[in-house]
């Protein structure tokens, strides 16, 4: 095959090599860009900047090599359009720094920066951390800072991400209230800050105020839906990004729903309770306090992270006729109480021949501490059990 005369020539089925001296000053309009998985660039002293627009349309790119060229600056968002990039070789260029944002969101298996006149500063603290943690093949490169010695020896005591403090109201928040949150940002080289409010949706009317170093946020006319929703303050500097999330607890009264008993692995009387703060629960059977034990007990389903409503079961291990009757769930919090009742019939009484007669069962009206503790299961956590002595 005749040698390729162009600035960039195909290499394999989805690669491109650009090695003709000085032929490129940008990466616009590369041939077959949308299918490229590998791009090799060498000896391009006029290629000094790499920016977002340069790599637009290179969505399949896996390997990018720009070596022995004039690269001085790589924009923090340069690789936004190349999310699959896994190998990045920028060795032997004129790079003095590289922002942590440049590689954020990429899953780089390899990052090569040797042969650049790097300038040791807090802006390279992230790279020093990669070196310490053995990431991306960085340790093997033994990176040097120009005239300053090894990157590994760079002092980093003052290189911290911003510190955030979010002030939330101490007092109880009620439905319809306005809530003011303030995010205080401290740290060196602050660049940007803001609020992330994606979870809020219709939970409140949002008004932002102020800027660095003190950001304000007013949540007006809050609803109970605001509970369990994250309000996040973020800030960035040259070292990295910090985020702090808070939740505003909006008080509202207890509510409860009961559903028909269902036979699953065991029998279950399903319920839903809501309220903030979380209501305390108590079961009655035929009007008397139901003693919970290991044979009849309240069991909650895994809670949804972003809502206050809790679903669960009064679980009965293979109940008999003595369990037939009226079940009432009482829920109460400081803002109100609610109850719901349901009749459950599990089994006919083997000793009753007249189905019209009442079942002769009486229950102790005395409450016990046998329900102490919240039997909520939290996945992927070692649960700390409640321990109660009875007798």
């Amino acid at each position: 095959a005749a040698p390729c005369p162009d600035a960039c020539c195909p290499h394999g089925s989805s690669g491109l090599r650009c090695t003709r001296d000085g032929a490129l000053d940008s990466l616009h309009h590369l041939p077959g860009a949308e299918n490229l998985t590998e791009l090799y660039i060498e000896n391009q002293q006029h290629l000094q900047h790499l920016e977002l627009r340069d790599l637009r349309g290179l969505g399949e790119l896996r390997n990018l090599t720009i070596v022995k060229s004039g690269l001085r600056f790589v924009a923090p968002d340069a690789f936004h359009f190349t999310p699959r990039l896994s190998r990045l070789n920028l060795s032997f260029n004129a790079l003095e720094s590289l922002s942590w944002k440049t590689v954020q969101g990429l899953s780089l298996q390899e990052l090569v920066l040797s042969g650049n006149p790097l300038h040791c500063s807090c802006a390279l603290r992230w790279l020093q951390r990669w070196e310490e943690e053995g990431l991306g093949g960085v340790p093997e490169q033994k990176l040097q800072c120009h005239g300053q010695g090894p990157l590994a020896h760079m002092p980093n005591a003052s290189c911290g991400v911003p510190t955030l403090k979010v002030q939330v109201p101490n007092a109880s928040v009620d439905v319809g209230d306005d809530v003011l949150l303030r995010c205080q940002v401290e740290g060196r080289g602050l660049e940007q800050a803001g609020w992330i409010l994606t979870e809020l949706e219709q939970s409140a009317t949002v008004m932002k105020s102020g800027g660095l170093p003190s950001l304000g946020l007013t949540l007006a006319n809050v609803t109970s839906d605001l509970n369990r929703k994250n309000v996040t303050c973020w800030a960035e500097n040259d070292v990295g990004r910090a985020e702090v999330s808070v939740q505003v607890n909006v008080s509202f009264p207890a509510s409860v729903q009961l559903h028909t008993a269902v036979e699953m692995h065991h029998w279950c009387i399903p319920f839903s309770v809501d309220g903030q703060p979380a209501p305390s629960l108590r079961w009655l059977f035929n009007g008397s306090v139901l003693n919970e034990t290991s044979f009849i007990f309240t069991e909650f389903l895994e809670p949804a992270a972003n809502e206050t409503v809790r679903h669960g079961c009064l679980r009965l291990n293979q109940p008999t006729h003595v369990n037939n009757g009226n079940y009432t769930l009482l829920a109460a919090n400081p803002f109100g109480q609610a109850s719901a009742s349901i009749m459950a019939a599990f089994m006919d009484n083997p000793f009753e021949f007249n189905p019209e007669d009442p079942i002769p069962v009486s229950f102790s009206p005395v409450d016990t501490n046998s329900t102490s503790g919240d039997p909520v299961e939290k996945k992927d956590e070692t649960p700390f059990g409640v321990s109660v002595a009875v007798g």
């Epitope: 692995h265 069962v361 102790s364 321990s387």
Partner: antibody
Framework: EVQLLESGGGLVQPGGSLKLSCKAS????????LGWMKQRPGHGLEWIGD????????FYNENFKGQVTMSVDKSITTAYLQWNSLKASDTAMYYC?????????WGQGTTLTVSS | EIVMTQSPATLSLSVGERVTLSCKAS??????VSWYQQKPDQSPKLLIY???SRATGVPDRFTGSGSETDFTLTISSVQAEDLAAYHC?????????FGGGTKLEIK
């Protein structure tokens, strides 16, 4: 087939410590409470306590509170009953049992003898 | 705690006889009574739960009855393999408690 298999009993000196194991198999371990019973000749059965592997909740008989500790390793579906300072009155047969329809499955038991 | 009292302590019967074992609770246990059979050198086995429901695989000669504080286990026709101690227990309220047992001997 539901099975409960106890182990760890034996002869221990007064003041010694011991941990009995109860290996459960053949059912969804975290779906049932598990109880421990003590049986001494002429004393009938005594309920020590029970616990729920799913949540870690435990209930102790007041007579045994502070004397024994129940614990569980969900990953190996095994329950434990532990003493830190054994007394002669702890000499007995110990059973673990599943709380299903009543205590519907029992282990074969393990004998603990506390004697010098 | 609720005290469960069983009577008699020992019973000697011939094969084929009918037997009734008694269990009394010191207070209402709402029908939450179980009966267990314990053969010599074996662990207890559940016979009856909820005062009257037979556990899986239990022969129908075993019948439980009663409510509130008085409960009985009836064996309609005693067999040689019924030689055992029989325990009643309440699981209505913590702490769960058991009776002292009734020992059934075969003549």
């Amino acid at each position: 087939e539901v099975q409960l298999l106890e182990s760890g009993g034996g002869l221990v000196q007064p003041g010694g410590s011991l941990k009995l194991s109860c290996k459960a198999s053949g059912y969804a371990f975290t779906n049932y409470w598990l109880g421990w019973m003590k049986q001494r000749p002429g004393h009938g059965l005594e309920w020590i306590g029970d616990f729920y592997p799913r949540t870690g909740n435990t209930f102790y008989n007041e007579n045994f509170k502070g004397q024994v500790t129940m614990s569980v390793d969900k990953s190996i579906t095994t329950a434990y009953l532990q003493w830190n300072s054994l007394k002669a009155s702890d000499t007995a047969m110990y059973y673990c049992a599943r709380a299903g329809t009543g205590f519907d499955y029992w282990g074969q038991g393990t004998t603990l003898t506390v004697s010098s | 705690e609720i005290v469960m009292t069983q009577s008699p302590a020992t019973l000697s019967l011939s094969v084929g006889e009918r037997v009734t074992l008694s269990c009394k609770a010191s207070e209402n246990v709402g029908g939450y009574v179980s009966w267990y059979q314990q053969k010599p050198d074996q662990s207890p086995k559940l016979l009856i739960y909820g005062a009257s429901s037979r556990a899986t695989g239990v022969p129908d000669r075993f019948t439980g009855s009663g409510s509130e504080t008085d409960f009985t286990l009836t064996i309609s026709s005693v067999q040689a393999e019924d030689l055992a101690a029989y325990h009643c227990g309440q699981n209505y309220i913590y702490p769960f408690t058991f009776g002292g047992g009734t020992k059934l001997e075969i003549k």
